[in-house]
């Protein structure tokens, strides 16, 4: 039961803070069933849509990526931007809309939508700007550096998934982001159905693990009009390998 009030502040277009709890819920992350705030939730006040600050693609929706809004802009001021459609220019897979990937600088079609989860930690620069957020943060902090030189365990506060130990991702929980286990085959995942819905989650699951993608559960015993449960499932054998 959600007995809380979530107030979405109007100052969402500020640059992301450095460190533990930056950004907002991410594309590679899904809400636990039943815990996604519905649009009409009586406990919630949602402002008119404003750009979300972010530090990496993971913090944006499935149809968004994280970048400076202007080419060559200040890498410290990044927001979630709408994904790029087929045949549009790109620099990495996350820039392309679901069902597409970045090949030779152009978004092209793919028959699988699992690149973002698998490559989220490979490239974090945007438009040629190197924003070593974590390094910059750990140099500035006065907390024990031990926190940042050892990979976060389950429940540790994190900024991005690369802060977490193997098999964990960085996902929102309450008012922080913490390391949680990456989902295994058969575990429930949730696909974001409407744009911006990821901004309402305060509990997130990780993305599906390597070789898995979040798909509708094929259950012949379920009635066709029943709720469509998504689970982590093995990729089809004919999928392409586009990772670099």
């Amino acid at each position: 039961t959600l007995n809380s009030v979530l107030n979405s502040n109007a100052i969402k277009n500020l640059p992301p803070p450095l460190g533990g709890a930056a950004g907002h819920p991410g594309s590679a992350v899904s809400a636990a069933p039943g815990i996604l705030y519905p649009g009409g939730n009586k406990y919630q006040t949602i402002d008119n849509y404003q750009p979300y600050p972010c530090a990496e693609d993971e913090e944006c929706g499935t149809d968004e990526y994280c970048a400076s809004p202007t080419r060559g802009g200040d890498a410290g001021v990044q927001i979630c931007l709408a994904c790029r459609k087929r045949r549009k220019r790109c620099m990495r897979h996350a820039m392309c809309c679901p069902g597409n990937y970045c090949k030779n600088g152009i978004c092209v079609s793919s028959d699988q939508n699992h690149f973002r989860g698998e490559i989220e930690e490979t490239i974090t620069e945007s438009f040629g700007n190197d924003h070593s957020t974590l390094d910059g943060y750990s140099r500035r902090t006065t907390l024990s550096s031990k926190m940042y030189h050892t990979k976060g365990q389950e429940g540790s506060v994190c900024l991005r998934s690369s802060d977490c130990a193997s098999g964990l991702c960085c996902a929102r929980h309450f008012w922080s982001k913490i390391c949680k286990p990456v989902l295994k085959e058969g575990q429930v995942c949730t696909k974001h159905r409407r744009k911006g819905s990821h901004g309402l989650e305060i509990f997130q699951r990780c993305y599906c693990g390597e070789g898995l993608s979040c798909r509708i559960q094929k259950d012949h015993h379920q009635a066709s009009n029943s709720s469509r449960l998504h689970t982590c499932q093995r990729h089809h054998h004919h999928h392409h390998h586009h990772h670099h």
């Epitope: 959600l2 930056a22 429940g155 008012w175």
Partner: antibody, heavy 117, light 111 residues
Framework: EVQLVESGGGLVQPGGSLRLSCAAS????????ISWVRQAPGKGLEWVAS???????YYPDSVKGRFTISRDNAKNSLYLQMNSLRAEDTAVYYC???????????WGQGTTVTVSS | EIVLTQSPATLSLSPGERATLSCRAS??????????MNWYQQKPGQAPRLLIY???KQGSGIPARFSGSGSGTDFTLTISSLEPEDFAVYYC?????????FGGGTKVEIK
């Protein structure tokens, strides 16, 4: 060293207002969620409010509409504006943050609020 | 909201003895592969201090004699050998759901 220092407590009449402050040091304040937790005399602990690093705010039903949590990252300060105070709001108010894990892992020493006529 | 019930309310023990404190949740506090149960110690006139988070992980600087176990709805805090400074009140707290809630506490006193 991480430090959280609360202030602003005192005696107030029912229906009155009070503003608590929490001065933080020893960590990059703007990055982390920070909360208020209270403890009535001789009683247990109760979560009062939280504000995330991305500036969303959260409250339980017991204080919703009466209390407002806010933060000033430039001043490394957290605030709790308490209006329409009731006798049952009498407590020690602690600010607490989650720096290394999701629990309340660092606490201030608390400030006492007494609501009485 | 999730209700946490701690037992016993008071535990009378001598230094060197083993203390076992229990916390039962009204519903499971497990999710995302984590048990969202924490334990705090509070001495008179002082702020609470985090001992254990995620059911069994030690907080920063916590002595090895403090350990946590359990999953689902039943959790245990164990102090393997009580030191004089361990006599205090201990609270469990869940972070699975909003609002986060605390148990009523267990007072560990000197026998």
């Amino acid at each position: 060293e991480v430090q959280l220092v609360e202030s602003g407590g005192g005696l107030v009449q029912p229906g009155g207002s009070l503003r608590l402050s929490c001065a933080a040091s020893g960590f990059t304040f703007s990055s982390y969620a920070i909360s208020w937790v209270r403890q009535a005399p001789g009683k247990g602990l109760e979560w009062v409010a939280s504000v995330s690093g991305w500036l969303d705010t959260y409250y339980p039903d017991s204080v919703k509409g009466r209390f407002t949590i806010s933060r000033d990252n430039a001043k490394n300060s957290l605030y709790l504006q308490m209006n329409s105070l009731r006798a049952e709001d009498t407590a020690v108010y602690y600010c607490a943050t989650s720096l290394q894990n999701y629990a309340f892992d660092y606490w201030g020493q608390g400030t006492t609020v007494t609501v009485s006529s | 909201e999730i209700v946490l019930t701690q037992s016993p309310a008071t535990l009378s023990l001598s230094p060197g003895e083993r203390a076992t404190l229990s916390c039962r949740a009204s519903e499971s506090v497990d999710d995302f592969g984590i048990s969202f149960m924490n334990w705090y110690q509070q001495k008179p006139g002082q702020a609470p201090r985090l001992l254990i988070y995620a059911a069994s992980k030690q907080g920063s600087g916590i002595p090895a004699r403090f350990s946590g176990s359990g999953s689902g709805t039943d959790f245990t805090l164990t102090i393997s050998s009580l030191e004089p400074e361990d006599f205090a009140v201990y609270y469990c707290q869940q972070s699975k759901e909003v609002p986060p809630t605390f148990g009523g506490g267990t007072k560990v006193e000197i026998k």
